[in-house]
Amino acid sequence: MRTEAQVPALQPPEPGLEGAMGHRTLVLPWVLLTLCVTAGTPEVWVQVRMEATELSSFTIRCGFLGSGSISLVTVSWGGPNGAGGTTLAVLHPERGIRQWAPARQARWETQSSISLILEGSGASSPCANTTFCCKFASFPEGSWEACGSLPPSSDPGLSAPPTPAPILRADLAGILGVSGVLLFGCVYLLHLLRRHKHRPAPRLQPSRTSPQAPRARAWAPSQASQAALHVPYATINTSCRPATLDTAHPHGGPSWWASLPTHAAHRPQGPAAWASTPIPARGSFVSVENGLYAQAGERPPHTGPGLTLFPDPRGPRAMEGPLGVR
């Protein structure tokens, strides 16, 4: 589910026509072009496994395939966080792990992957068709989420292989961080190419390679994902979602998430992947953790008359670094 942009293949000029200076001038544009072409988006993979020993026990494993430092991970079920999903756990690399029943044991497996054991019975018991989602907030990529569920026919003890399920959602800082550098590089590249064009230099020859040649993964949403904005939220059957959780659905307002399960009925072996459109930026990157709690499937329960919404509790040290990571 990546948006891809075609990049025309450029041929270097024939040697000897511009001399050493020309070669040196063109090294930087080629490096920048390579960066522009190969720069990819991070990915999140989700693996859901039902334990053979206990049919009501699930293990969810999630990982982040990106170069940034992870500042928060949120695991939810019943759909993406903030779109009807209910938070099961929040894992902060500096502050610890906050989890809600029926989550039993959330933990970091590596610097970029986590696992969560779910146990339950009755109303708070997950079942095979429950969708589990993992959202990784990282710097500078922003916030990325993917979802998965057990294939309906899978045997206990088996699991779908971890499948990368990227989502085209990046918070402002992620876009400005990585994309900003790339955008600057690409603009500079075009500037150099334009300068180069205005000289009596040799022309760029028509491509002799396949038109499918290098492809750049773009940050902008594709037409398909833009169309997703107009698609009503489609939830995989989650009849086993809990009725007794302390966390409930997010409060009012339209959801910015529009999800499109990418797996078809005839292809049930992989976890569900969810596409989404970039959501409006919330002002600053530090607000990602606020957002996670503000949409984390909370109820505003039994609140007194004066309850108002504030930025989420992170303590006074929260601003010392991205999401309190110092």
Epitope: G96, F310, G315
Partner: antibody
Framework: QVQLVQSGAEVKKPGASVKVSCKAS????????MHWVRQAPGQGLEWIGE????????NYNEQFRNRVTMTVDTSTSTVYMELSSLRSEDTAVYYC?????????????WGQGTLVTVSS | DIVMTQSPDSLAVSLGERATINCKSS????????????LAWYQQKPGQPPKLLVY???TRESGVPDRFSGSGSGTDFTLTISSLQAEDVAVYFC?????????FGGGTKLEIK
């Protein structure tokens, strides 16, 4: 300075409910989760649950899940903990405590405690 | 839930001497991400609420005298009072602050010999 002031001692009959309050001052109230911890006479400490004052999000210890309700009134910077279906083993000192700014579950400021006695 | 076990239950130490209290957790409290151990120590004097002394196993809370020090990693932790003072008589609790629900040790009563 940070102050957490709790309501006074309570004597309740088995089966009744008790509601303890904790008024916070001296810091940004919405910025810290508030926790409730109890201590039976001569015993250790037991975590009951926590509440996010900024949005009312709660998280309860499984052992108390069906009997406890935590609420917040931001206009008075007060959190409440209500425990229902009281039994004699609920006799304890109940503390509210604020979480430490750099970790979710270390508790750096505590109320003075509220003794709840359950007796027939 | 993570089970915290303290030893000894009670301890008598002479004034000016070193006091050592141990705490063991049923699973590792070491966070692989930042290599911090999520273990806290509290002091509770009679009729008072607990007071945070140390968190992250060895980080002293502001205002806590430097005779109090925490050490250990993984599942085994120690609180050391280098030179016992009369005002240190109290019950000391360890607590894991790594994940929900936070759990406490049973406490160690420290007295003067």
């Amino acid at each position: 300075q940070v102050q957490l002031v709790q309501s006074g001692a309570e004597v309740k009959k088995p089966g009744a409910s008790v509601k303890v309050s904790c008024k916070a001052s001296g810091y940004s109230f919405p910025s810290y989760w508030m926790h409730w911890v109890r201590q039976a006479p001569g015993q250790g400490l037991e975590w009951i649950g926590e509440i996010n004052p900024s949005n009312g999000l709660t998280n309860y210890n499984e052992q108390f899940r069906n009997r406890v309700t935590m609420t917040v009134d931001t206009s008075t910077s007060t959190v409440y903990m209500e425990l229902s279906s009281l039994r004699s083993e609920d006799t304890a000192v109940y503390y509210c405590a604020r979480h430490h700014g750099s970790t979710y579950y270390a508790l750096d400021s505590w109320g003075q405690g509220t003794l709840v006695t359950v007796s027939s | 839930d993570i089970v915290m076990t303290q030893s000894p239950d009670s301890l008598a130490v002479s004034l000016g001497e070193r006091a050592t209290i141990n705490c063991k957790s049923s699973q590792s409290l070491l966070n692989s991400i930042n290599q911090k151990n999520f273990l806290a120590w509290y002091q509770q004097k009679p009729g008072q609420p607990p007071k945070l002394l140390v968190y992250f196993a060895s980080t002293r809370e502001s205002g806590v005298p430097d005779r109090f020090s925490g050490s250990g990693s993984g599942t085994d932790f120690t609180l050391t009072i280098s030179s016992l003072q009369a005002e240190d008589v109290a019950v000391y609790f360890c607590q894991q602050h790594y994940s929900t629900p936070p759990t406490f040790g049973g406490g160690t009563k420290l007295e003067i010999k």
